[in-house]
Amino acid sequence: AGVFELQIHSFGPGPGPGAPRSPCSARLPCRLFFRVCLKPGLSEEAAESPCALGAALSARGPVYTEQPGAPAPDLPLPDGLLQVPFRDAWPGTFSFIIETWREELGDQIGGPAWSLLARVAGRRRLAAGGPWARDIQRAGAWELRFSYRARCEPPAVGTACTRLCRPRSAPSRCGPGLRPCAPLEDECEAPLVCRAGCSPEHGFCEQPGECRCLEGWTGPLCTVPVSTSSCLSPRGPSSATTGCLVPGPGPCDGNPCANGGSCSETPRSFECTCPRGFYGLRCEVSGVTCADGPCFNGGLCVGGADPDSAYICHCPPGFQGSNCEKRVDRCSLQPCRNGGLCLDLGHALRCRCRAGFAGPRCEHDLDDCAGRACANGGTCVEGGGAHRCSCALGFGGRDCRERADPCAARPCAHGGRCYAHFSGLVCACAPGYMGARCEFPVHPDGASALPAAPPGLRPGDPQRYL
């Protein structure tokens, strides 16, 4: 058993351009806190997977208010270490996630709001009992500087905290086959292995394979609290014969609350008030819970489906991640069909469809002429998703409902005069021009640039355009 310790040295803007804006403002003061999550081995595990080695939350840092116009400095940090106790052997190789959280202290209904500022992750090799290791990690424009170490809790020693040490029985040397415990040369290695299942909290052994109980506990594995039912007094150390308690210390003696929990006596036994980041009857369960407010962007927090996951954030559409902290670029999935333009409005996804297509995802190809009649003998033409009418002579407009003024567009060139006719228009050309639209000049020698005019028409006569 032992403790992984993390010391945050600084959190602030990283080097280079693009310094981040301060996360706090005069209108919205805030403070930082940190969360560390440890997993055994060097696997590239997702942030969502359980913190199998343990997790811890720091205290809240001092309240910080940005000075207007000043760049974001290194932000004030919480006091103290983050400590993650581990019960079994230290694995030697581990993965870590360190999250920097901001607690906004504005006038929030229902308490303060939390948001994730930065998350760094890494994989490291580390021997227990070694010196502090220093590290720098960057997340976007932010930089986190920290140190960490793993140390064994007595009587465990060694790079994995699996060897046990105990004081020498003789001043000069250790017993047969036992080595001195480096670096504690005045102690000897203890090859004791207690009975399998012996309670690590309430049992101990002086001979291999035995399980001796601490006061107040009984049973072959020291997991059974001593009964008080047949005793006169409700507390005290056990009598070896009766298993009864005689007057003595109370249920909070020795503080049964782990991880800095405070103990208070109750009529039935005791109660632990746990620090943030721990819960359970003895504050023995580490990790963030729904009470810590881990979900963002409208995510709702419910309990995890298994004991290892203390919470699950159910994210609304548009967000994902274990804390609903990641905005989904829903347009990257190209949901709009037939060339529609995708718009992610945050609360909804919209497709702006090209002409001739409709539906939430532009999936419907419109039959443009269906149910559409072109008036006055016009015919409907489909094309490019847009409906169009080809109108009979003398009619125009989208549905051929408008009587056309064929002269409105001034169709006669070179000063020719336009006359409306029941079947179209007639251009009366100015001298020197001819053609249906008076578009051709008459040559000076009297020959036209076109083949000869039809019989009965002289150049300069009005030409009817059919």
């Epitope: 929030q108 209904i109 229902g110 308490g111 303060p112 709001a113 939390w114 008030t273 819960y279 819970t289 729904c290 009470a291 810590d292 407010g293 881990p294 979900c295 963002f296 409208g298 995510g299 709702l300 927090c301 419910v302 309990g303 203390a310 919470y311 954030c313 609304p316 559409p317 548009g318 609903c324 945050g346 609360h347 909804a348």
Partner: antibody, heavy 121, light 107 residues
């Protein structure tokens, strides 16, 4: 201050539908889930479902899936619950409540006064 | 569905008494347990969230404790305005459920 306004009472006939309203004020309507809770006379509270105004997403109690339909109108900051195929079992007081939502807190911090629905021919 | 059992059903007390109301869950709800007070002909009011977190505007005489399946709402020195029905509610899993309530009445 936060307020959720509900009409006092609705008298409806068996087999018909009724649409209950819940008008919110005093906070950002689109940022907080709204939940609906049923309370029959002299009895406990039953959760019906929640709706997130910004997206219209819902969580539903299976028991009420074919009974209650939750909607919102963000322009008027109003949440609605339509109850269909009404029977005498649906006679109850229906509360809307605001969910804290900040940090994911699934807790009802402000409640409407409730609408009393009576189903009678 | 998680069933929340509240006891006692009715508690008769005199102003000034200190009382404890119990809420027991049919399976662990971790610390996702909240308490509400409902007075006659009124809507419920949030008292305590997440087992022991206080709510602004709620008197400090109300406190909560417990973990897993057993929870307690304590009222230190009951006042006349405290009479009504108290409900516990879990948000550990869907569907959200409430206890049947404990009625705190004047002795």
């Amino acid at each position: 201050q936060v307020q959720l306004q509900q009409p006092g009472a609705e008298l409806v006939k068996p087999g018909t539908s009724v649409k209950l309203s819940c008008k919110a004020s005093g906070y950002t309507f689109t940022s907080h889930w709204i939940t609906w809770v049923k309370q029959r006379p002299g009895q406990g509270l039953e959760w019906i479902g929640d709706i997130y105004p910004i997206s219209g997403s819902t969580n539903n109690n299976e028991k009420f899936r074919n009974k209650a339909t939750l909607t919102v109108d963000t322009s008027s900051s109003t949440a609605y619950m339509q109850l269909s195929s009404l029977t005498s079992e649906d006679s109850a007081v229906y509360f809307c409540a605001k969910i804290i939502t900040v940090g994911g807190a699934y807790v009802m911090d402000y409640w409407g006064q409730g609408t009393s629905v009576t189903v009678s021919s | 569905d998680i069933v929340l059992t509240q006891s006692p059903v009715t508690l008769s007390v005199t102003p000034g008494d200190s009382v404890s109301l119990s809420c027991r869950a049919s399976q662990s709800v971790r610390n996702n347990l909240h308490w509400y007070q409902q007075k006659s002909h009124e809507s419920p009011r949030l008292l305590i969230k997440y087992v022991s977190q206080s709510i602004s505007g709620i008197p400090s005489r109300f406190s909560g404790s417990g973990s897993g399946t057993d929870f307690t709402l304590s009222i230190n020195s009951v006042e006349t305005e405290d009479f009504g029905v108290y409900f516990c509610q879990q948000s550990n899993s869907w569907p959200l459920t409430f206890g049947a309530g404990t009625k705190l009445e004047l002795k």
